[in-house]
Amino acid sequence: APSCPQNVNISGGTFTLSHGWAPGSLLTYSCPQGLYPSPASRLCKSSGQWQTPGATRSLSKAVCKPVRCPAPVSFENGIYTPRLGSYPVGGNVSFECEDGFILRGSPVRQCRPNGMWDGETAVCDNGAGHCPNPGISLGAVRTGFRFGHGDKVRYRCSSNLVLTGSSERECQGNGVWSGTEPICRQPYSYDFPEDVAPALGTSFSHMLGATNPTQKTKESLGRKIQIQRSGHLNLYLLLDCSQSVSENDFLIFKESASLMVDRIFSFEINVSVAIITFASEPKVLMSVLNDNSRDMTEVISSLENANYKDHENGTGTNTYAALNSVYLMMNNQMRLLGMETMAWQEIRHAIILLTDGKSNMGGSPKTAVDHIREILNINQKRNDYLDIYAIGVGKLDVDWRELNELGSKKDGERHAFILQDTKALHQVFEHMLDVSKLTDTICGVGNMSANASDQERTPWHVTIKPKSQETCRGALISDQWVLTAAHCFRDGNDHSLWRVNVGDPKSQWGKEFLIEKAVISPGFDVFAKKNQGILEFYGDDIALLKLAQKVKMSTHARPICLPCTMEANLALRRPQGSTCRDHENELLNKQSVPAHFVALNGSKLNINLKMGVEWTSCAEVVSQEKTMFPNLTDVREVVTDQFLCSGTQEDESPCKGESGGAVFLERRFRFFQVGLVSWGLYNPCLGSADKNSRKRAPRSKVPPPRDFHINLFRMQPWLRQHLGDVLNFLPL
């Protein structure tokens, strides 16, 4: 077969080929940020000629053109400056209102390198309508100027701009406009991952936390966010495998979907996942009717088995057939469960479509969506039961209109996105399901995204200050209790001057809380074994602090999961009859268990907890410590089975001021506290300049570093005695 000519360079940009120079290969241009390629792509035809999708005239030279943002077409009850036909990247537009009108949204907006304006639509409103003035986004024209209950407004975009969002909105009884805000965008514009992740995440969190059907609440503005622990979610992942998707891109589709599956199973909800790949025909790799669809490992393994070559005989993009296979799956499930049953009616459905282009065969995908909406009986009351996310990847031939038509439209949410490439998609899926935004006291959730602050990564972490200086660390285990070390409290019982500093999204310095009461283990006495030549003994080194007020849950403040509780059981996704022993077997399940603690500067440091035989050799080193234990005969007199041991090889050692902080593990994207920092043989911070300086112990140090942490599995009776009405403990 003839190959296509190689004279396809783009001045100022680069290109990639999906299948070399052979027929069927898609050539994709890219330009530096702030520029866009024209044309975006070319397809090598069987004749050996390049064809530009959608082009009417003959092949023109590819060039990188400057990105521009659309200008306002009209701005009501105010003025904007400067008045240009379109705006360059970095250019600003400012808005001011006439007297009697208040500006809502952004007074100044800047054109971003992806051709999208930053900020929010500026609206001059006098608050006269039943619904607020819905505004006119930049580049749009609105018809309809009445904002009473039942009134409708319609939008269209000027010139060659593409509308995403709702072209028609209705003022509802609750004072909220139906649908989602329309945005007019350049056909070549795309979304930045950092904008998509929170938008997608907010919507997804809404869906995951949709109001519990058994709880009758009056209709609130927007959707109530609340983890619904009893609900069921069907998640349908549709992966485009058509010819224009390169094998490498398909791998990233799969990886992104795996990330999604991993995250979704970390929520405390029942979930079934369907996996469908499609090109000319769909292929169902996992159906929600299969029991394995509820098992994360099974779902991920079916994803891993998805093969790019499965679709090599039919390489078109039949989005209709893919969505129709979802419809058929729903239909079968409805017949199985019974149309009128709660079991069927209470299932929430989320479809995520990952595609790189427009459907080019099989009819309009919108028809399949209409069938799906019909079978699920989606109306204003049941709007929460279906979410369709349409994600286009690789600005090339993605059809904004089609994606927008397929994506759900819900107030304050977005469901249709176009990303620049599969790398951006991966980033989005990594960051989108950020449960840490939830206001509920769900435990053990840390923000794992690359741009999260230290406190967002470990939001349970608190600092304890006796007076002005920080002295110890601790962990929130509920919204009012902190777990820490007893040895931090050596000044008798006057805790009136003590403060606990808790993370706060509004302040980088956190928020200080007074202590209502301190419960220090009565068994703790550092001098208990002085007569035996043990100058310091840290048995029972555990304390609980009750804060004077409840902590408001946020991205920066949230409890860690304590093993042996129902809360941790949910997070571990263990069956209901699980015991404390089961948790210990699951969490401390190896000779060397990777764990973490938080450093003085807030960063997360790594250790390995030694178990079984390795615990014995880890603890043995204490016999070399002659200052603290001058005539020690039995190491177990000092290192009782209350302690976990770390500090071998490459482990970091905690500093004195890190005492009381959580020793924790990560499982299924959730964090579990198994110990608390108590004492050690080496202090890496001693005499350092500041919190960021730690010194590694020299290899020749005698004794070598060792660190001992109170093992929470060994403190169960005490924890249950004091927290029995705060946490729900499992049987031992």
């Epitope: 200086q469 050596r490 310091e536 200052t627 603290m628 004195k656 001021g657 005499g687 350092s688 300049a689």
Partner: nanobody
Framework: QVQLVESGGGLVQPGGSLRLSCAAS????????MGWFRQAPGKEREFVAS????????EYADSVKGRFTISRDNSKNTLYLQMNSLRAEDTAVYYC???????????????WGQGTLVTVSS
């Protein structure tokens, strides 16, 4: 906050000995880790030795290990530094410090004495 006053510095020959004292006012002395730092002319302040609030554990800088001994007497609210086999490079102003956590981070320490000068010279 603990108030600290050092004493015992002076001129001593190489190989000689000196005992520094640090008197602390405030009933909370017994609950603080205590330490000695020193600062030679034109140099940064450096850690010398520390002792835990219990008196049970001590730490030394490598440069003084085996020559200096830190101790405390909680009944007298006093910290000591016994310095033997002194060398010219031990010449510095010696400061006493109190730290509740025991890390003695220079950026965080708020209880320092005014210092006592030790000169080792023949």
């Amino acid at each position: 906050q603990v108030q600290l006053v050092e004493s015992g510095g002076g001129l001593v020959q190489p190989g000689g000995s000196l005992r520094l004292s640090c008197a602390a006012s405030g009933h909370t002395f017994r609950s603080y880790y205590m330490g000695w730092f020193r600062q030679a002319p034109g140099k940064e302040r450096e850690f010398v030795a520390s002792i835990s609030w219990t008196g049970g554990s001590t730490e030394y800088a490598d440069s003084v290990k085996g020559r200096f001994t830190i101790s405390r007497d909680n009944s007298k609210n006093t910290l000591y530094l016994q310095m033997n086999s002194l060398r010219a490079e031990d010449t510095a102003v010696y400061y006493c410090a109190a730290d509740y956590s025991g890390d003695f981070l220079l950026s965080d320490l708020d209880s320092w004495g005014q210092g006592t000068l030790v000169t080792v010279s023949s």
